[in-house]
């Protein structure tokens, strides 16, 4: 069971300091941006991280949403990353959810965060290079210290 607590507005960066944003085609990618660029590209660079009380505490349970034309919430259903047109719900009556991720700090690096899928244990959000782009995917953690699954989260409230 997950019960919604408070939400915060955040900018999410990969360890190359690239900013996560949603383009016009609702596609998530990471791009080089200054703090000023990130503000200028709002709301597509501003993510709503909603925190949830977890009946089985396993880290901070969160949903990740963005409000462009409509509110879309990140999903890892079927191990496929997509943004679904939906508001983060107030309650989720299950111990797993495609839209719930466990946000945890990386041991020894308090400012670095990982987001593990609650539906697929051991699968994390990752920034992976494809062609000349850094895309957001879901990735199984295969080796310790994998930088692609580490992010910084900067509160904008």
């Amino acid at each position: 069971y997950f019960g919604k607590l408070e939400s915060k507005l955040s900018v999410i960066r990969n360890l190359n300091d690239q900013v996560l944003f949603i383009d016009q085609g609702n596609r998530p990618l990471f791009e080089d941006m200054t703090d000023s660029d990130a503000r200028d590209n709002a709301p597509r660079t501003i993510f709503i991280i909603s925190m949830y009380k977890d009946s089985q505490p396993r880290g901070m349970a969160v949903t990740i949403s963005v409000k462009a034309e409509k509110i879309s919430t990140l999903s890892a259903e079927n191990k496929i990353i997509s943004f679904k047109e939906m508001n983060p719900p107030d309650n989720i009556k299950d111990t797993k959810s495609d839209i719930i991720f466990f946000q945890r700090s990386v041991p020894g690096h308090d400012n670095k965060m990982q987001f593990e899928s609650s539906s697929y244990e051991g699968y994390f959000l990752a920034a992976e290079k494809e062609r000349d782009l850094f895309k957001l995917i879901l990735k199984k953690e295969d080796e310790l210290g994998d930088r692609s699954i580490m992010f910084t989260v900067q509160n904008e409230d």
């Epitope: 596609r27 079927n78 191990k79 496929i80 992976e128 062609r131 895309k135 957001l136 295969d142």
Partner: antibody
Framework: EVQLVQSGTEVKKPGESLKISCKGS????????IGWVRQMPGKGLEWMGF????????RYSPTFQGQVTISADKSFNTAFLQWSSLKASDTAMYYC??????????????WGQGTMVTVSS | EIVMTQSPATLSVSPGERATLSCRAS??????LAWYQQKPGQAPRLFIY???TRATDIPARFSGSGSGTEFTLTISSLQSEDFAVYYC??????????FGQGTRLEIK
């Protein structure tokens, strides 16, 4: 370059076995589903099944369940489609295709060049 | 399974003219529809996803519309390279995806 490269043309006799391959490169192969699609001569596209190379989870179309086996070897970034006993009606072009994630979710965003399989006595 | 029906089976249009291809789903699929182009001897290529969004590098003359059960692919001014077979595909209840039977777009 992001691509899927399939094995070459096959000519087989009815009753023979066959395994064709699809090798991904230029992306994290273990993080995307691969689908197999059949196209019989002069016909349309039919989905056969999916595999997630990261953990070898498979999903089959009811039409093809029990008729073919889909597998993967993640150490070689390769997916496979195999038959234990071919029939003349298996003659077709077989495509592997990547299922989009993040970008183009649930669609086939990258396709292999196809493997033509001919089964004839 | 969701049945996808495309019409017409063959469409003859002159270069420079507009082409309109239709795709109907047997039940509502929201906007979970893709369009692919296939040329002879080639693999299909993704053109449109979520019913109306063009994939990377797809020309602006291609546009998709519709939601629910009725969908349309429109090519505003046909170029010679556009003559091909077009398939729609639903992914509303993935992994049970289904394709339409295709529309052959030929030169009039």
């Amino acid at each position: 370059e992001v691509q899927l490269v399939q094995s070459g043309t096959e000519v087989k006799k009815p009753g023979e076995s066959l395994k064709i391959s699809c090798k991904g490169s230029g992306y994290t192969v273990t993080s995307y589903w691969i689908g197999w699609v059949r196209q019989m001569p002069g016909k349309g596209l039919e989905w056969m099944g999916f595999i997630y190379p990261g953990d070898s989870e498979t999903r089959y179309s009811p039409t093809f369940q029990g008729q073919v086996t889909i597998s993967a070897d993640k150490s070689f970034n390769t997916a496979f489609l195999q038959w234990s006993s071919l029939k003349a009606s298996d003659t077709a072009m077989y495509y592997c295709a990547r299922v989009g994630s993040g970008w183009y979710p649930y669609t086939f965003d990258i396709w292999g060049q196809g493997t033509m399989v001919t089964v004839s006595s | 399974e969701i049945v996808m029906t495309q019409s017409p089976a063959t469409l003859s249009v002159s270069p420079g003219e507009r082409a309109t291809l239709s795709c109907r789903a047997s039940e509502s699929i929201s906007s979970n529809l893709a369009w692919y182009q296939q040329k002879p001897g080639q693999a299909p290529r993704l053109f449109i996803y979520t019913a109306s969004t063009r994939a990377t590098d797809i020309p602006a003359r291609f546009s998709g519309s519709g939601s629910g059960t009725e969908f349309t692919l429109t090519i505003s001014s046909l170029q010679s390279e556009d003559f091909a077979v077009y398939y729609c595909q639903q992914y509303n209840n993935w992994p049970s995806i289904t394709f339409g039977q295709g529309t052959r777009l030929e030169i009039k």
